[in-house]
C-alpha cells in the first residue's frame, strides 16, 4: 500500500531573468527513493538517480542546476518557462509518486506593478 505523500511548492511565480527552486518532498513512507525525474509538461528536464547521480537534459544544461537535495533550480527564466512541472519519485517497494508545481514567469515590470498595487 502506498502511504507516502508528496509536498510541493505548489503555485509559484518568479521574475523573467531570475531563478526559482522547484522542490518536492516525499514523506510518510519508509520506501527507498531510487530515482526522481523532473519534467516540464512532457519534456524531461533532469533525472536524479540514487546510484548514478544527476543527469540534466542537454537542452537545459546551461540554465538548470541540480539541488538543493533532490530539488531543481531553474535559472535565466523566460516567459516560455511558464507552465506545469512534475516531480516523479520512483520508490521501492511503493512505486511511483508524482507532484505538480505550476510556475508563472512574470515580466519584471508586471511583477513590480503587482507588488505595489493590490486589488482590494
Amino acid at each position: 500500500m502506498m502511504t507516502g505523500t508528496i509536498e510541493t511548492t505548489g503555485n509559484i511565480s518568479a521574475e523573467k531573468g531570475g531563478s526559482i527552486i522547484l522542490q518536492c518532498h516525499l514523506s510518510s513512507t519508509t520506501a527507498q527513493v531510487t530515482q526522481v525525474n523532473w519534467e516540464q509538461q512532457d519534456q524531461l528536464l533532469a533525472i536524479c538517480n540514487a546510484d548514478l547521480g544527476w543527469h540534466i537534459s542537454p537542452s537545459f544544461k546551461d540554465r538548470v542546476a541540480p539541488g538543493p537535495g533532490l530539488g531543481l533550480t531553474l535559472q535565466s527564466l523566460t516567459v516560455n518557462d511558464t507552465g506545469e512541472y512534475f516531480c516523479i519519485y520512483h520508490t521501492y517497494p511503493d512505486g511511483t509518486y508524482t507532484g505538480r508545481i505550476f510556475l508563472e514567469v512574470l515580466e519584471s515590470s508586471v511583477a513590480e506593478h503587482g507588488a505595489r498595487f493590490q486589488i482590494p
Epitope: H25, S27, L52, G53, I56, L70
Partner: antibody, heavy 117, light 107 residues
Framework: EVQLQQSGTVLARPGASVKMSCKAS????????MHWVKQRPGQGLEWIGG????????NYNQKFKGKAKLTAVTSASTANMELSSLTNEDSAVYYC??????????WGQGTSVTVSS | DVVLTQSPATLSVTPGDSVSLSCRAS??????LHWYQQKSHESPRLLIK???QSISGIPSRFSGSGSGTDFTLSINSVETEDFGMYFC?????????FGGGTKLEIK
Amino acid sequence: EVQLQQSGTVLARPGASVKMSCKASGYSITSYWMHWVKQRPGQGLEWIGGIYPGNSNTNYNQKFKGKAKLTAVTSASTANMELSSLTNEDSAVYYCTREGGYGMDYWGQGTSVTVSS
Amino acid sequence: DVVLTQSPATLSVTPGDSVSLSCRASQTISNNLHWYQQKSHESPRLLIKYSSQSISGIPSRFSGSGSGTDFTLSINSVETEDFGMYFCQQSYSWPYTFGGGTKLEIK
C-alpha cells in the same frame, strides 16, 4: 569503487593562499556535486560550498565567499579549492565529499592546513 | 539559514544500551535530514539519508525517524565500534548546514 583522493598536508604563512585538490575515481564527476567541509580541531563540521562540475554551478556558504574559490577540471576528474588571505582561523582539516541528491555518501581523507608564522 | 541543534552534546552509554540522538531544525525541512558518524581521526560516514532511509553497508541497528523540525537517530544495542561523533545535516535549502554534533562515549 568510488574514491576521493585529497592532496597532502599544507603549512602556510598568514596572508598566503593555498590550493588543494580532490581527485575522483570510480564515477562520473559531472553527475555529482562536490562539496567542501571544514573541521577545526575538536570541532564540528562546517559546509563551505559546493560545485557541480556538470555545468560549473557553485553554491557558497556566505561566510566563505571571498575566502574560498571552488573549481573543477572535468577532464582530470578533479575538484579544487583555493583559500586566500589565510589566518589562524583557517587552520583545519578540509574534506571534499560528493553528493548526488541522496546525502554526502563518499568523503575524501581530508587535507590538513596549518597556518603559522 | 537553517540552524540544526543536536542534543545531548555528550551521551555516555554502556555497550548493549539502546540510545536516541536528537536533531532539531530552526524551521521545517520536511525529511531533508541526513545523519553521519565520525570516529576519531577518520572522515565522516553517511548513516541515514532523508530522515529514515537506510544506507547500504550500514548495520541495521541504526535507524532514523522524524519530519518537519524534530529528528531522531536511534541505535539499537550500541556496540563498541559505534562510539564517536554523530552529526545531522540538512539539504532542504542552501546553504547546507550541519548540527553541532553529539559525542557518544563509553560510560
